[in-house]
Structures are given as C-alpha cells and as structure tokens.
C-alpha cells in the first residue's frame, strides 16, 4: 500500500559534501546526504541509512518520500515543516525506522499528504495529536487518505501504563481530523478489543485491516456508519462467533467484502445464526475455508457444511444436580 517510485534514474548525493553545505541555506533541489533522489519520479529515498533525524534539506519537488529502515527514535512537532513547505509531499513511508515516539503536530505543514506508513515502529508514545496537529476539539481536516499502522505495538515492557488500543484510537479520533480517511491498516498490533467509538467517527473508510490481532468479539463494535466500507480484514484473530447484530450490519453494507480466515470458531449452539448467514451471504471471501476449532469433536469441520443438529451446547445443570 505504500508508494513505489518509477524506474527513473536516481542521483545520490556525496556524503562528504554534507558538512560543507549544512552551514549554508540548502540549495532548492539538492539531494540530502545519504539519500537518492529522482526529480523525474518526484521521489526521495533515504533507506536503511541509520538516519537519526529527518533530513532538513529535502528537495521541494518531493512527492514520494521513503525514510524506511532508519533510527529516528522520535518524530518531533513539525518534523517535515520547511520554508517553503513541502507542498507536493503526498506519500510518506517511515516504516521500520525505530520510532518509539511521535509527537503532536509531527506531520503539520504537509498540505498534500495523502499516504502515511508508520508500520513496524514500536510506538510506545503516539501523541493523541500526532495526526490532527492541535488539541482543538475540531481540528482542520487532515488530507490523509491512507494511514498504515501495521505492527506498531511496542514490546510489553516498553508500553506505557495505559491501553495501547486506547492510545491509537485517541490519535485516530483527535479533532475529528481524519474524517476523509479511506484506508486504515491496524494489522498485527495485539489488539484485544476495538473501542466502540472509533468506527463511528471515520465515516469515509473504504478499507479496514484488523488482521492478525487478538480480537475475541465484535459484540460492541458497530459498522453501521461505515456505509461504503469495501474490505474488512479480520483474518488471524481470536474470534469465536459473530452474533446477529454484527451479521445484520455487515449484510447491510452493499459494497463490503469480509475476510474471516484463521479464527478459532466455536461450533456450538451460539454458532447457528452465523452458519445460516454464511450459507446465504455473498460478502464473505473464501467462506468455504472457514472451519471449527472448538469443541474438540467439531475441530476442522467446515462451517458451511454444518446443520443445526451439529450445533449443540452442553446443558447447564441446575446447582442442585451439579456434583463437586
């Protein structure tokens, strides 16, 4: 989902020039030290260079900026603010750059920024105002259309004393700045739950990727506001069953495709509605691959092949009949 440049020729700047130039104002379209630049492709790549900060002398023409595989650690406020501003910058990839803190207003003064990838950074401290830029209750709309936040969960010992889910959601909702967001990827973040208010405030979402998390239930999550959602990736979670309310909401979204592979479906009496729905719906991709994980006697049975007689629950004995 991140931008790739065209195969135009890249010019590399000579590292030994960096110190000589740094004291002077940057030339308008020079290439920063340790980067490769292609004006034709409007692309700058500063990849796997162990950079500890964002280069100050980025060329004004840059539309696609790759700062992957570095050691940035902290992204301060106005990390990309320049005079004149980087008015053309549309796609920014910061994945795998050892970022553990993104401060308020880190992406301010990027009026054309449509695509942002912060994946594979251990974000222990993501400011609530990282994307909105201000603590106003309603901020200026962000131009972001795609936000890629896959595998940004820090190691457990580096997490703050707060919910990681809550920290991420606070950044997504602050100032209602991300109302225009169309793609949100939150895969591989050990999410145990999805805060119920997050989806209601992202009405433009077309693609939502929650795959490879630890979601157990969607009972309190509403998809109703995501009227034009096209893909919902829930593969590789810990889902046991989808209940009627969720099924009805998904069925009511006319453009949706739902991806449910590799969840530990529990095939007991509570699964009956979901099985009935699966047999009728067209919205689930690869529905014939969904299999039971529990109970043991049902393991590997295909959900589509089950009937109501297969889906029973062990009766709960009244206390007087229970034995110790």
């Amino acid at each position: 989902s991140s931008p790739t440049s065209s195969a135009s020729s890249f010019s590399s700047s000579a590292p030994f020039l960096a110190s000589a130039v740094s004291a002077q104002p940057p030339l308008p379209d020079q290439c920063p030290a340790l980067c490769e630049c292609s004006e034709a492709a409007r692309t700058v790549k500063c990849v796997n260079r162990n950079l500890t900060e964002v280069p100050t002398d980025l060329p004004a023409y840059v539309r696609n900026l790759f700062l992957t595989g570095n050691q940035l650690a902290v992204l301060p406020a106005g990390a990309f603010a320049r005079r004149p501003p980087l008015a053309e910058l549309a796609a920014l990839n910061l994945s795998g750059s050892r970022l553990d803190e993104v401060r308020a207003g880190a992406f301010e003064h990027l009026p054309s920024l449509r695509q942002l990838d912060l994946s594979h950074n251990p974000l222990a401290d993501l400011s609530p105002f990282a994307f909105s830029g201000s603590n106003a209750s309603v901020s200026a709309p962000s131009p972001l259309v795609e936000l890629i936040l896959n595998h940004i969960v820090p190691p457990e010992d580096e997490r703050q004393n707060r919910s990681f889910e809550g920290m991420v959601v606070a950044a997504l909702l602050a100032g209602r700045a991300l109302q225009g967001l169309r793609r949100l990827e939150l895969a591989s973040n050990h999410f145990l739950y999805l805060p119920r208010d997050v989806l209601a405030q992202l009405p433009s979402l077309r693609h939502l990727d929650l795959s490879n998390n630890s979601l157990v239930s969607l009972t309190y999550v509403s998809f109703r506001n995501l009227t034009h959602l096209e893909s919902l990736h829930l593969e590789d979670n810990a889902l046991k069953v989808l209940h009627n309310g969720t099924l009805a909401e998904l069925q009511g979204l006319p453009h949706i495709r739902v991806f449910l592979d590799n969840n530990p479906w529990v095939c007991d009496c509570h699964m009956a509605d979901m099985v009935t729905w699966l047999k009728e719906t067209e919205v689930v991709q690869g529905k014939d691959r969904l299999t039971c994980a529990y109970p043991e006697k049902m393991r590997n049975r295909v959900l589509l092949e089950l009937n109501s007689a297969d889906l029973d629950c062990d009766p709960i004995l009244p206390p007087s009949l229970q034995t110790s």
Epitope: S1, P3, H207, T227, E230, P254, H255, R257, Q285
Partner: antibody, heavy 115, light 107 residues
Framework: EVQLVQSGAEVKKPGATVKISCKVS????????MNWVQQAPGKGLEWIGR????????NYNGKFKGRVTITADTSTDTAYMELSSLRSEDTAVYFC????????WGQGTLVTVSS | DIQMTQSPSSLSASVGDRVTISCRAS??????LNWYQQKPGKAVKLLIY???RLHSGVPSRFSGSGSGTDFTFTISSLQPEDIATYFC?????????FGGGTKLEIK
Amino acid sequence: EVQLVQSGAEVKKPGATVKISCKVSGYAFSSSWMNWVQQAPGKGLEWIGRIYREDGHTNYNGKFKGRVTITADTSTDTAYMELSSLRSEDTAVYFCANGGAMDYWGQGTLVTVSS
Amino acid sequence: DIQMTQSPSSLSASVGDRVTISCRASQDISNYLNWYQQKPGKAVKLLIYYTSRLHSGVPSRFSGSGSGTDFTFTISSLQPEDIATYFCQQDNTLPWTFGGGTKLEIK
C-alpha cells in the same frame, strides 16, 4: 486522482463477442470495485455488473447474465468486460466506473453491432 | 429490481436560479442514493453519494437530501458550466439501477 482509460471503439457483427478493457491509474486511492455501465444511443444508464478486483468476486445484472463476463488482472490494474452473442440492441457506449458509489468513470467505449 | 423515477425529464433555468430535481425509488433504499453529472463527450462525474455527501472536488452549490424512497438534488445557484444531464442511482440493492435522467438547459 484516479483515472480510467478504456480501449477504443469496436465494430462487431451480430453473434460476435466484444472484450473491452479499462486500465486504472492513480491506483493508491482507487477502489477495489470496478463497475460496468451501458448507455444505448439517446438512452439512460444501465448497470451491467461489477468485480471486486482483489479476489475476482462478481455481481451481474440479470438482464446481461449469461452473456457478460467481467474479469480483472491485478498485475496490470486492468479490468475487462466481455459481452457475447451480440445483437443490434447492444450498440451502445460502455463505461467502466471505479468505486462502490462509482466515484470515477472512464471515457466510454462505443460498440457498434451491425451486419 | 428497484425502479428509479426521476423528474422532470428536462428543465430550463437561468444562471443564478435554484434548481431542484427529484428521484423516487420503488422501495426503501435507506440513504444509498447517488447523483451523477454527464456532459456530452466527457466522463460521467459523481457529485453526491449516500444522499447528501459531497464527492471530493465538487462545488458546495450542489447538495442532496431525502431518505427511504424520496430524494432531492439541488443546485443552489445555477452556473453556465452546470448545463448537463443529471442521473440518480441507487446502490442499496443489487442490481444497481439509475433514474432516466434530467436534461438541464439554460434559459
């Protein structure tokens, strides 16, 4: 901005098959759904069908079912609409339209069916 | 299939006028109603989706309202470049269906 570029005009004989292409550029923000719409001369718009490009899932309008096949090649970001057993009333401009709500449209491809 | 009935089929108005077009669905389509603009020889443009949401880059003089079966499209102050044919379309229930179109002309 998403742009859709369709293949050129076609002239076909009754009973023949036509295959129209639609190439997507500006892909980063394009939709997974590609729709096809027919507009006969002096007439309104009629939805033919759609494809979800990532997994090939299709929906068709019953009026065209059995004669139309919609496919997509994700490696080239191109969608195709093939209409078989052509008859004179299939003479029309055919549009591809990207998005659930058909956000962006191609310029149209005129197909003329004439003996 | 859901029938979409659009009225009027043509209308003539002056620059600066407020113009309204109606669209009625043969059954409830919630808010899944879109409006498109078609100019001769140009690509069709989405103006409004989900009854009232303005598509990106569309001027704010265009608006939409309604729900269920009855919908309205409004141009608050007609401009010369608005001369076109306008279509409504439902995307609530397959197959998607369009209204017959409204041809808008300048007086």
